[in-house]
């Protein structure tokens, strides 16, 4: 039983450096505890952006210093990444693990290409 994970192919971050996307998984089992990890792949380098473990029906809780926030609804996780700059442009991959009860299942999405464009600085004003 494979676990399929779906996420949008492309997302454009807002001018404030915020990007949101949905990570949806087709659960082969009745998991009560799920871990979602966002991985960034750029230039063959992989870094963990954030991770959260949540109980089904409860909210996702990322660490206090995390750049991610999120909400869950059934087998769908709405992820928001903030504080993004142009240099953070890259492929953001959603990894889902069904942690409990056993058996464990792993699913990895194809990734969401997030484009971040730094806003132009405001021109000096005489006012």
């Amino acid at each position: 039983k494979a676990m399929h994970v779906a996420q949008p192919a492309v997302v454009l971050a807002s001018s404030r450096g915020i990007a949101s996307f949905v990570c949806e998984y087709a659960s082969p089992g009745k998991a009560t505890e799920v871990r979602v990890t966002v991985l960034r792949q750029a230039d063959s380098q992989v870094t963990e952006v954030c991770a959260a473990t949540y109980m089904m029906g409860n909210e996702l809780t990322f660490l206090d210093d995390s750049i991610c926030t999120g909400t869950s609804s059934g087998n769908q996780v709405n992820l928001t990444i903030q504080g993004l700059r142009a240099m953070d442009t890259g492929l953001y991959i959603c990894k889902v693990e069904l942690m409990y009860p056993p058996p464990y299942y792993l699913g990895i999405g194809n990734g969401t290409q997030i484009y971040v464009i730094d806003p132009e600085p405001c021109p000096d004003s005489d006012f």
């Epitope: 039983k1 494979a2 505890e33 991985l39 992989v46 991770a51 473990t53 056993p102 058996p103 792993l106």
Partner: antibody, heavy 119, light 106 residues
Framework: QVQLVESGGGVVQPGRSLRLSCIAS????????MHWVRQAPGKGLEWVAV????????HYADSVKGRFTISRDNSKNTLYLQMNSLRAEDTAVYYC????????????WGQGTLVTVSS | EIVLTQSPGTLSLSPGERATLSCRAS?????LAWYQQKPGQAPRLLIY???SRATGIPDRFSGSGSGTDFTLTISRLEPEDFAVYYC?????????FGQGTKVEIK
């Protein structure tokens, strides 16, 4: 660099207990699932147990369920395997292994510690 | 539990030759890894995700396949490549290994 060093192996009689330890260094220990994998003399590899991330979730192979307990101390970067009610068929080299970024394959392994169960 | 069957059990080849190792799963597998093990040493990760080379692994090693049939290919055998190779599935627990293929010098 990533390093995993096991200890605690030895010769033990059937029915007795033994505790293995694995000290990790060179990475953020709490961010990875940590596994024990064993290999009986002249045989193949067998996954034994995993302790996930914060330590609250654990999974075991059926062959050791109810007898072995995996645990971790993230403050000490250490993984443990408490082995009770040992049997002759538990004789093996026990490896501590780190789960990979992309899932529970094993990207780094310790050198292994030999456990021999014999009367 | 997913059963992985590797073939052949032993492969006798000469340095410079191409080695093709097979791993067949009892049911469809989403994620597969390959390891190399030399006598008295711990296994070493070669391939994960069926085809992604692990850090520091030479490009003569390549993995392919999906579903139930996977292949590890060593394009030109070097003297240090003679060892036992294992496949492992990691899409669902319990994580299982194949019984191994020994690549020996002919």
């Amino acid at each position: 660099q990533v390093q995993l060093v096991e200890s605690g192996g030895g010769v033990v009689q059937p029915g007795r207990s033994l505790r293995l330890s694995c000290i990790a260094s060179g990475f953020t220990f709490s961010s990875y699932g940590m596994h024990w994998v064993r290999q009986a003399p002249g045989k193949g590899l067998e996954w034994v147990a995993v302790n996930w991330y914060d330590g609250s979730n654990k999974h075991y192979a059926d062959s050791v369920k109810g007898r072995f307990t995996i645990s971790r101390d993230n403050s000490k970067n250490t993984l443990y395997l408490q082995m009770n009610s040992l049997r002759a068929e538990d004789t093996a080299v026990y490896y501590c292994a780190r789960g990979g970024v992309w899932g529970p394959y094993f990207d780094y392994w310790g050198q292994g510690t030999l456990v021999t169960v014999s009367s | 539990e997913i059963v992985l069957t590797q073939s052949p059990g032993t492969l006798s080849l000469s340095p410079g030759e191409r080695a093709t190792l097979s791993c067949r799963a009892s049911q469809s597998v989403s994620y597969l890894a390959w390891y190399q093990q030399k006598p008295g040493q711990a296994p070493r990760l070669l391939i994960y995700g069926a085809s992604s080379r692990a850090t520091g692994i030479p490009d003569r090693f390549s993995g392919s396949g999906s579903g139930t049939d996977f292949t590890l290919t060593i394009s030109r055998l070097e003297p240090e490549d003679f060892a036992v190779y294992y496949c492992q599935q990691y899409g669902s627990s319990p994580w299982t290994f194949g019984q191994g293929t020994k690549v020996e010098i002919k």
